[in-house]
């Protein structure tokens, strides 16, 4: 009971995660603009993996797409890389997770055969999550880089009058989506992982019995033969589990009434 | 069709209040009350979100003026305290649009604080 | 604050002229997000409430005839007015739509000579 609990749970957590991990990878505000000494301003500068945007106080926004991929930064490239292989690795995980779960029967599918996707499944879960994890550190890794930086040269301009002062951009709402949501799915595997261990058939350690039958006397060694467990009976005592699985655009728009809460 | 009506405006004294009304038809996300004084020129005063109620005044009116709306009135208001003679002027409310500029304003009202 | 300087304050034309306004802020007015410079210019008549005329700097607002075009970028910016027409006579304003608070040029008032 406690195992499939697990499992169900880490299923459901890493579902969680890995919505979460599509919605950061699909959201704008990867960096906001910072509002250091302006609480309210006119024009709100943020953007995303995929485009950026500007927020009129009229209302107005507009959005623009990274149309170009070798013109845009390294580290850009790489986070968008890390968040995609991590929503590919969980979307493979889920689909996985759910021929593997316990409650789930599907035809007849031993416990072992199980075991193996669902710790394969929680594997994706900890890879998926770790890979956003990584993703949005690398991303906010780099806004801090370039906040002191801009911050350094804030005010550039000749003969001391100030002429432009200079964006700055500070963590977006899809950083913590990211963190958060990596976090659960890591979470997700690990649990998953852990119900692995209960789903795997212990070992039945019998001692070696000799039957002697008239006429002719036979030996029966004990080997790693499948525990009952489940529906049904092993009847034909196949060793099929030897423990081995038992390891650790341009979009432009005015906002509706429902826009702001 | 976006229509703005504004009222209210008058004759008050030095240090007294009024409240100027602006009736709003059609789609305002932002409005604004700009003033200007007898043969000077555009000055804003302040901001409000229509859907937030979020303002924003300009330094001279902070404290003084209090710029709010009524949903269900459909109605844009700027309470202005502590009065002054110069601010003596004809208030407009002006809805903000792409790229912030205004391009609708009401007809005008003319305030007079004078004793 | 932004401060916006207008020259010259008056100008007196013909109809057929091109009639040329500057307009300096006192810090940029482009925005780094999209590359637009946030100035507004308008256009008012005595006794009238000011017509939007430009915004972004050089996007025209639908309905203004074409003969009135906007350009600079940074801190400098135009208003020409490619052949000025009896109806033109007029007073006009440019903006920063950049930063609240929003402040606007001290006119420049365009005469018939």
């Known amino acids: 009971m406690a195992v499939t609990a697990c499992q169900g749970l880490g299923f459901v957590v890493s579902l969680i995660g890995i919505a979460g991990i599509i919605a950061a990878t699909c959201m704008d505000q990867w960096s906001t603009q910072d509002l250091y000494n302006n609480p309210v301003t006119a024009v709100f500068n943020y953007q995303g993996l995929w485009r950026s945007c500007v927020r009129e106080s009229s209302g107005f926004t507009e959005c623009r797409g990274y149309f170009t991929l070798l013109g845009l930064p390294a580290m850009l490239q790489a986070v968008r890389a890390l968040m995609i292989v991590g929503i590919v690795l969980g979307a493979i995980g889920l689909l996985v997770s759910i021929f593997a779960l316990k409650c789930i029967r599907i035809g007849s599918m031993e416990d072992s055969a199980k075991a193996n996707m669902t710790l394969t499944s929680g594997i994706m879960f900890i890879v998926s999550g770790l890979c956003a994890i990584a993703g949005v550190s690398v991303f906010a890794n780099m806004l801090v880089t370039n906040f002191w930086m801009s911050t350094a040269n804030m005010y550039t301009g000749m003969g001391g009058m100030v002429q432009t002062v200079q964006t700055r951009y500070t963590f977006g709402a899809a950083l913590f989506v990211g963190w958060v949501a990596g976090g659960l799915t890591l979470i997700g595997g690990v649990m998953m992982c852990i119900a692995c261990r209960g789903l795997a058939p212990e070992e039945t350690n019998y001692k070696a019995v000799s039957y002697h039958a008239s006429g002719h006397s036979v030996a029966y060694k004990p080997g790693g033969f499948k525990a009952s467990t489940g529906f049904g009976s092993n009847t034909k005592n196949k060793k099929i589990y030897d423990g081995g699985a038992r390891t650790e655009d341009e979009v432009q728009s005015y906002p509706s009434k429902h826009d702001y809460v | 069709e976006v229509q703005l009506v504004e009222s209210g405006g008058g004759l008050v004294q030095p240090g007294g209040s009024l409240r100027l009304s602006c009736a709003v038809s059609?789609?305002?996300?932002?409005m604004n009350w700009v003033r200007q004084a007898p043969g000077k020129g555009l000055e804003w005063v302040a901001w409000?979100?229509?859907?937030?109620?979020?303002?924003t005044y300009a330094d001279d009116f902070k404290g003084r003026f209090t710029i709010s709306r009524d949903d269900s009135k459909n109605t844009l208001y700027l309470q202005m305290n502590s009065l002054r003679a110069e601010d003596t002027a004809v208030y407009y409310c002006?809805?903000?649009?792409?790229?912030?500029?205004?391009?609708?304003w009401g007809q005008g009202t003319l305030v007079t604080v004078s004793s | 604050d932004i401060q916006m300087t207008q020259s010259p304050s008056s100008l007196s034309a013909s109809v057929g002229d091109r009639v040329t306004i500057t307009c300096k802020s006192s810090q940029s007015l482009l925005n780094s997000g999209n590359q637009k410079s946030y100035l507004t210019w308008y256009q008012q008549k005595p006794g009238k409430a000011p017509k939007l005329l430009i915004y972004?700097?050089?996007t025209l607002e639908s309905g203004v005839p074409s003969r009135f075009s906007g350009s600079g970028s940074g801190t400098d910016y135009t208003l020409t007015i490619s052949s000025l027409q009896p109806e033109d006579f007029a007073t006009y304003y440019c903006?920063?739509?950049?930063?609240?608070?929003?402040?606007f040029g001290q006119g420049t008032k365009v005469e018939i000579k």
């Open positions: 903006q920063n739509a950049y930063s609240f608070p929003f402040t």
């Open positions: 059609g789609y305002t996300f932002s």
């Open positions: 002006a809805r903000l649009v792409k790229g912030n500029g205004f391009d609708y």
């Open positions: 409000i979100n229509m859907y937030t109620g979020e303002p």
């Open positions: 972004w700097a050089s």
